[in-house]
């Protein structure tokens, strides 16, 4: 039967727990992204972030991911969700502020 | 290792039922969407039904919709392609699907496929 | 219903370039999806999001997509490149696969 949607941001989560423990070298090279408001269209607007990082195998699976929770199609410099684009941060710390965000979600059982 | 593998496939006659399961191993199948896509004999794919893991929505082809019915059940690891009043043109190997994730899955991509199940439908 | 059209056939000889095309209106709006298929064998995802290839994809697969055409394209094709190829995208809450084609390494 019907599966609560927690499963799909359980995995989520533990895909960029994965990133944060098996980082050794500079995640994607120490690439810069957007920061983004952590908010409503959250999962756009971190896919339209981490979209511009490219030959980062690192993260691959996570833009993958993302795209599952996001409902249009998101290119290479594409900003509609991206409302704010003003500070850049490191791919590392971005990763880590979105996994904080949704282990917060998730506790709260804000799963949409 | 990520597996998928189907059973329940058969000889059934003209306005027959049958069954499809679809084991899964190596993940957890409740976090993902789970497709059937069938193939005719020399032809091509043919999408046939979805079970999205967010909600547990269901998805059909036209040429499926009101005859099949999608499901699944987590406990198991199983999804199921319950077929009924089956006609000829229903003849094909039927592929489980390891599809997508998130409620926007069909945005992921169809990664894990079955070996698939023959499903022939005739008098 | 929305429909994906593509080539009956491509034939290509060994090294060369063999590029396929999927046409369906405003394609290039939905992500493309491409898969292999060999004979007697199970669909493979060999491209996803228009030009990603999965881990253990060889480098030589690459796809693109915009307007109303998705296209893949096998660089130096390889006579194991040899096999039946079917685009996919979703709309209006079905999946549609292409026609497919079928590659051959001359």
């Known amino acids: 039967g019907p599966v609560p949607p927690s499963t799909a941001l359980r995995e989520l989560i533990e895909e960029l727990v994965n990133i944060t423990q098996n980082q050794k070298a500079p995640l994607c090279n120490g690439s810069m992204v957007w920061s983004i408001n952590l908010t409503a269209g959250m999962y756009c607007a971190a896919l339209e972030s981490l979209i511009n990082v490219s030959g980062c195998s690192a993260i691959e699976k996570t833009q993958r991911m993302l795209s599952g929770f996001c409902p249009h199609k998101v290119s290479a410099g594409q900003f509609s969700s991206l409302h704010v684009r003003d500070t850049k941060i490191e791919v590392a710390q971005f990763v880590k502020d979105l996994l904080l965000h949704l282990k917060k979600l998730f506790r709260e059982g804000q799963f949409n | 290792e990520v597996q998928l593998l189907e059973s329940g496939g058969g000889l059934v006659q003209p306005g027959g039922s049958l069954r499809l399961s679809c084991a899964a191993s190596?993940?957890?199948?409740?976090?993902?969407?789970g497709s059937w896509v069938r193939q005719a004999p020399g032809k091509g794919l043919e999408w046939v039904s979805a079970?999205?893991?967010?909600?547990?929505?269901?998805y059909y082809a036209d040429s499926v919709k009101g005859r099949f019915t999608i499901s699944r059940d987590n406990s198991k690891n199983t999804l199921y392609l319950q077929m009924n009043s089956l006609r000829a043109e229903d003849t094909a190997v039927y592929y489980c699907?390891?599809?997508?994730?998130?409620?926007?899955?069909?945005?992921?991509?169809?990664?894990?496929w079955g070996q698939g199940t023959t499903v022939t439908v005739s008098s | 219903s929305y429909e994906l059209t593509q080539p009956p056939s491509v034939s290509v000889s060994p090294g060369q370039t063999a590029s396929i095309t999927c046409s369906g209106d405003?394609?290039?709006?939905?992500?493309s999806f491409w898969f292999q298929q060999k004979p007697g064998q199970s669909p493979v995802l060999v491209i996803y999001h228009d030009s990603k290839r999965p881990s253990g994809i060889p480098e030589r697969f690459s796809g693109s997509n915009s307007g109303d055409t998705a296209t893949l394209t096998i660089s130096g094709t390889q006579a194991m490149d040899e096999a039946d190829y079917y685009c996919q995208a979703w709309d209006s809450s079905t999946y549609v696969f292409g026609t497919g084609t079928k590659v051959t390494v001359l």
């Open positions: 190596g993940f957890t199948f409740s976090s993902y969407a």
């Open positions: 699907v390891q599809d997508g994730l998130g409620p926007y899955f069909y945005n992921y991509g169809m990664d894990v």
């Open positions: 405003k394609l290039g709006d939905k992500y």
């Open positions: 079970f999205s893991g967010s909600g547990g929505s269901t």
